[in-house]
């Protein structure tokens, strides 16, 4: 009985299609694979950013795999062929590993790259990113922002820069169709006549950096002698009611401070008959049902009630 052997895949490589971090890992079948034509050959692929402790592992029948990487660091990957036991009348046969690496040759020293990059998706409608120039760069340095997400044919450059002293320090993005719940890739590179500028790469998902508008139409309603219902409306815009969490801050007679987090647009407050003044503000944030993270909105305008009898009217601001 001759021992069954299988070769590793050929021409294993990492291909950068220019999507700012979304890379293709691809390979060719091993030679003489057609001996196992009746059998599904699989490939075990392991990959990671250099410096990461853990490998991502994929088992696939395909000849390619796509994923996002941090291009600020290098990437390493390895792959081998797997012949399942059904192909060999015995135990699984594995080839040796084929290995490859990929990195973008860095230009310039790290200090020249943009500092304090901050991106906010205002009200799930308008993306704005801002940054500070690199440390010690001259005024002739200009930064350019490029972005890509699945659905775009190619990376696009910012067309509406925010400027300070003639330098680009931010970008107002156009309407980004079908861009949430997927990785959004950004590269900010730069040019200077003086010295090379280091590029920076960023990846996030837009629904996780949403800063909503504050709630509106704050009202009071007396429910009973000792209960007041606070109500408000969801902010205008595309975010559905089910996506909000709220934080309320309530002051009674300028002393008692109550803060609470709620999931809907009402809050019932226990009060005493001695309450002479009641004020509250609300802010909103996208909740865990719609995102993994978010940014609190600004506080709403303050709504106050001063007077004796809330039962006779509903106060509306």
């Amino acid at each position: 009985d001759t021992e069954i052997k299988v070769n590793p895949p050929q021409d294993f490589e990492i291909v950068d299609p220019g999507y700012l971090g979304y890379l293709y890992l691809q390979w060719q079948p091993p030679l003489s694979l057609d001996h196992f034509k009746e059998c599904t050959v699989e490939y075990e692929l392991k990959y990671r950013n250099i410096g990461s402790e853990t490998w991502k592992t994929i088992i696939t029948k395909n000849l390619h795999y796509k994923d996002g990487f941090d291009l600020n660091k290098g990437i390493e990957a390895k792959i081998h062929t797997l012949l399942p036991w059904q192909c060999t009348n015995g135990s699984e046969v594995q080839s040796s590993w084929a290995e490859t690496t990929y990195w973008i040759s860095p230009q310039g020293i790290p200090e020249t790259k943009v500092q304090d990059m901050d991106c906010v998706y205002y009200n799930w409608q308008y993306l704005l990113c801002s940054w500070k120039p690199g440390i010690g760069v001259l005024l002739d340095t200009n930064y350019n922002l490029f972005y890509w997400y699945e659905g775009l044919d190619h990376a696009l450059q910012c067309v509406d820069y925010i400027k300070a002293d003639g330098q680009n320090i931010g970008c107002r993005f156009p309407y980004l169709e079908a861009s949430d719940y997927k990785d959004f890739y950004i590269c900010v590179n730069g040019s200077s006549e003086n010295k090379p500028i280091r590029s920076s790469y960023f990846t996030f998902q837009l629904q996780n950096i949403v800063k909503p508008l504050p709630p509106v139409y704050l009202t009071f309603t007396r429910e009973s002698s000792c209960e007041i219902k606070l109500k408000w409306s969801i902010p205008l815009g595309p975010i559905p009611a089910r996506c909000f969490d709220y934080e309320i801050e309530i002051r009674e007679d300028d002393t008692t401070l109550v803060t609470a987090t709620v999931e809907n647009e009402t809050y019932t407050l226990k009060t005493t008959n001695e309450t002479r003044q009641l004020c509250f503000v609300v802010r909103s944030k996208v909740n865990i049902y719609c995102s993994d993270d978010g940014i609190w909105s600004e506080w709403s305008d303050k709504q106050c009630w001063e007077g004796e009898d809330l039962s006779k009217k509903t106060l509306l601001r």
Partner: antibody, heavy 118, light 107 residues
Framework: EVKLVESGGGLVKPGGSLKLSCAAS????????MSWVRQTPEKRLEWVAT????????YYPDSVKGRFTISRDNAKNNLYLQMSSLRSEDTALYYC???????????WGQGTSVTVSS | DIVMTQSQKFMSTSVGDRVSVTCKAS??????VAWYQQKPGQSPKALIY???YRYSGVPDRFTGSGSGTDFTLTISNVQSEDLAEFFC?????????FGGGTKLEIK
């Protein structure tokens, strides 16, 4: 429909240089290795060079190694063959071909003619 | 380098006949052999890969066989449009090498 269109051939003196191009369409270019194959005036087929889909791997026969360079621009779906130190024996019809999942060539262009003569 | 030898430069056949084109490798190439058809004035067209597997769209009149060093392309029920030259190629090792070709003539 897979289409490969070669260009850049012509008459060149011995020792001269020439750059051939191949414009590809109808398939995901970066997913396929590509080859150049030439056909001599005697109608023999000779493999000239192969490049992997991402361009990380290149292969040449000894007869052209150091003189010819295969490259690709995946953004433009173009394949290139830079030929230098040309000799009379490089005279041929040069085909661009797509490499299939092995190293056979499943699609071929129509070819571009290179004549090396003084 | 692996030499691929197609000993018959010309073969003559009639429409409806069956003809076999042979190719011999100078060393073992397993099943890593392809066959191409080149009609007059045209570029080569792929017929067979891995010695015996037809590319899609290739008529089943074309059959490949063999492994190791001896390979055969068989054309059954030859048609007039099969007038062409046929080349074998090995891809078991670089450099990739082709046979010298076999020209099929239709009587």
């Amino acid at each position: 429909e897979v289409k490969l269109v070669e260009s850049g051939g012509g008459l060149v003196k011995p020792g001269g240089s020439l750059k051939l191009s191949c414009a590809a369409s109808g398939f995901t270019f970066s997913s396929y290795g590509m080859s150049w194959v030439r056909q001599t005036p005697e109608k023999r087929l000779e493999w000239v060079a192969t490049i992997s889909g991402g361009g990380s791997y290149t292969y040449y026969p000894d007869s052209v190694k150091g003189r010819f360079t295969i490259s690709r621009d995946n953004a433009k779906n173009n394949l290139y063959l830079q030929m230098s130190s040309l000799r009379s024996e490089d005279t041929a019809l040069y085909y661009c071909a797509r490499r299939d999942l092995r190293s056979a060539m499943d699609y071929w262009g129509q070819g571009t003619s290179v004549t090396v003569s003084s | 380098d692996i030499v691929m030898t197609q000993s018959q430069k010309f073969m003559s056949t009639s429409v409806g006949d069956r003809v076999s084109v042979t190719c011999k490798a100078s060393q073992n190439v397993d099943i890593n052999v392809a066959w191409y058809q080149q009609k007059p004035g045209q570029s080569p067209k792929a017929l067979i890969y891995s010695a015996s597997y037809r590319y899609s769209g290739v008529p089943d009149r074309f059959t490949g066989s063999g492994s190791g060093t001896d390979f055969t392309l068989t054309i059954s029920n030859v048609q007039s449009e099969d007038l062409a030259e046929f080349f074998c190629q090995q891809y078991n090792n670089y450099p990739l090498t082709f046979g010298g070709g076999t020209k099929l003539e239709i009587k």
